[in-house]
Interface confidence: low
């Protein structure tokens, strides 16, 4: 029954790049500019996305395909299809509401974007520090402290609290 | 394409524990918090929490601080949100929504299909 | 926690109407406010971010403002795909709360 009804449909002959057009009979008119239908049988089509401001364009609208959006340098994409541009930090830095901030003594970042993370606690797997870390870096864990020579030390700071990335939207 | 499949509905009797899951495929589980949303019937919206999967840092709110429990299986990319001492009050829609790891600009963007959980004698 | 009032918890308009939706936050919450869009038995769907900000995909019609305080959705010309209800949230601070939601139907 299915089948029957979309053969009798004239707007299941309609191919992507076009619509339906109820204006003209249902023939299939050419998506206009600066749209797109990207399957068949479209009633309407769809109006291209556009790359403005901190958005550049990855990759051209067509009468077939949306256009893709990427963001600009010193800003990244988030979400999905790059919905967002975020600015970038240095690595040992975090984006709080007041700007790129330095990781707090104890935490690390070694990208341009996300959150500070505490540097590993090589104790809890009773192991020492082998090389500090820094704001850009996490430690290097080694032996344990039983294998190294008496009066090495094995101190890594406790984590700090750190402000959750959680942000909702 | 991105999805977060949550468990199916669960009825309970008051005083017992249940515990509901959200499955991630589709993206790096590990880069974007796991939020879980409360909404009982004909109610709004609350937020219960969230946790990082990377290192399964969370963050309550005071509220649920006794009731709920979050945790992940990375290996899985599942979430878990434990519910104890349930009391009919509980009854609820319960969602598993993700961001990503930037607190400030960060959006839901995308949302399981909610849990219903009943909790009657 | 940060309390959010919002106004009205419904109203009926006529389609084409613009609608406006506000919220109160209990303390400033500079413009870290969110705009949500609920339909009967579906998950919320998120519209606006950092007060004004739209979404991708989002259509035009919808629109923010406000910070501090007060914040307003608004919706330009109200369509038959609308009628939904309407939820803030405040994530300033932790926990995240959401306004109470209105409730908008058509006339």
């Known amino acids: 029954f299915e089948r029957t009804r979309s053969l009798q449909d004239p707007c299941s002959n309609c191919p992507a790049g076009t619509f339906c057009d109820n204006n003209r009979n249902q023939i299939c008119s050419p998506c206009p500019p600066n749209s797109f239908s990207s399957a068949g049988g479209q009633r309407t089509c769809d109006i291209c996305r556009q790359c403005k401001g901190v958005f550049r364009t990855r990759k051209e609208c067509s009468s077939t395909s949306n256009a893709e959006c990427d963001c600009t340098p010193g800003f990244h994409c988030l979400g999905a299809g790059c919905s967002m541009c975020e600015q970038d930090c240095k690595q040992g830095q975090e984006l709080t509401k007041k700007g790129c901030k330095d990781c707090c003594f104890g935490t690390f970042n070694d990208q341009k974007r996300g959150i500070c993370r505490p540097w590993t606690n090589c104790s809890l797997d009773g192991k020492s520090v082998l090389v500090n870390g820094t704001k850009e870096r996490d430690v290097v864990c080694g032996p344990s402290p039983a294998d190294l020579s008496p009066g090495a030390s094995s101190v890594t700071p406790p984590a700090p609290a750190r402000e959750p990335g959680h942000s909702p939207q | 394409q991105v999805q977060l499949v949550q468990s199916g509905a669960e009825v309970k009797k008051p005083g017992s524990s249940v515990k509901l899951s959200c499955k991630a495929s589709g993206y790096t589980f590990s880069s974007y918090w796991i939020n879980w949303v409360k909404q009982a019937p004909g109610q709004g919206l609350e937020w219960i929490g969230n946790i990082y999967p990377s290192d399964s840092y969370t963050n309550y709110n005071q509220k649920f601080k006794d009731k709920a429990t979050l945790t992940v299986d990375k290996s899985t990319s599942t979430a878990y949100m434990e519910l104890s001492s349930l009391r009919s009050e509980d009854t609820a829609v319960y969602y598993c929504?993700?961001?990503?790891?930037?607190?400030?600009?960060?959006?839901?963007?995308?949302w399981g299909q909610g849990t219903t959980l009943t909790v009657s004698s | 926690d940060i309390q959010m009032t919002q106004s009205p918890s419904s109203l009926s308009a006529s389609l084409g109407e613009r609608v406006t939706i506000t919220c109160k936050a209990s303390q400033d919450i500079n413009s870290y406010l969110s705009w949500f869009q609920q339909k009967p038995g579906k998950a919320p769907k998120t519209l606006i971010y950092r007060a004004n900000r739209l979404v991708d995909g989002v259509p035009s019609r919808f629109s923010g403002s406000g910070s501090g305080q007060d914040f307003t959705l608004t919706i330009s010309s109200l369509q038959p795909e609308d009628i939904a209800t309407y939820y803030c949230?405040?994530?300033?601070?932790?926990?995240?709360?959401f306004g109470g939601g209105t409730k908008v139907e058509i006339k």
């Open positions: 949230l405040q994530y300033d601070e932790l926990p995240p709360t």
């Open positions: 929504t993700r961001t990503w790891e930037f607190y400030y600009d960060s959006v839901f963007d995308y």
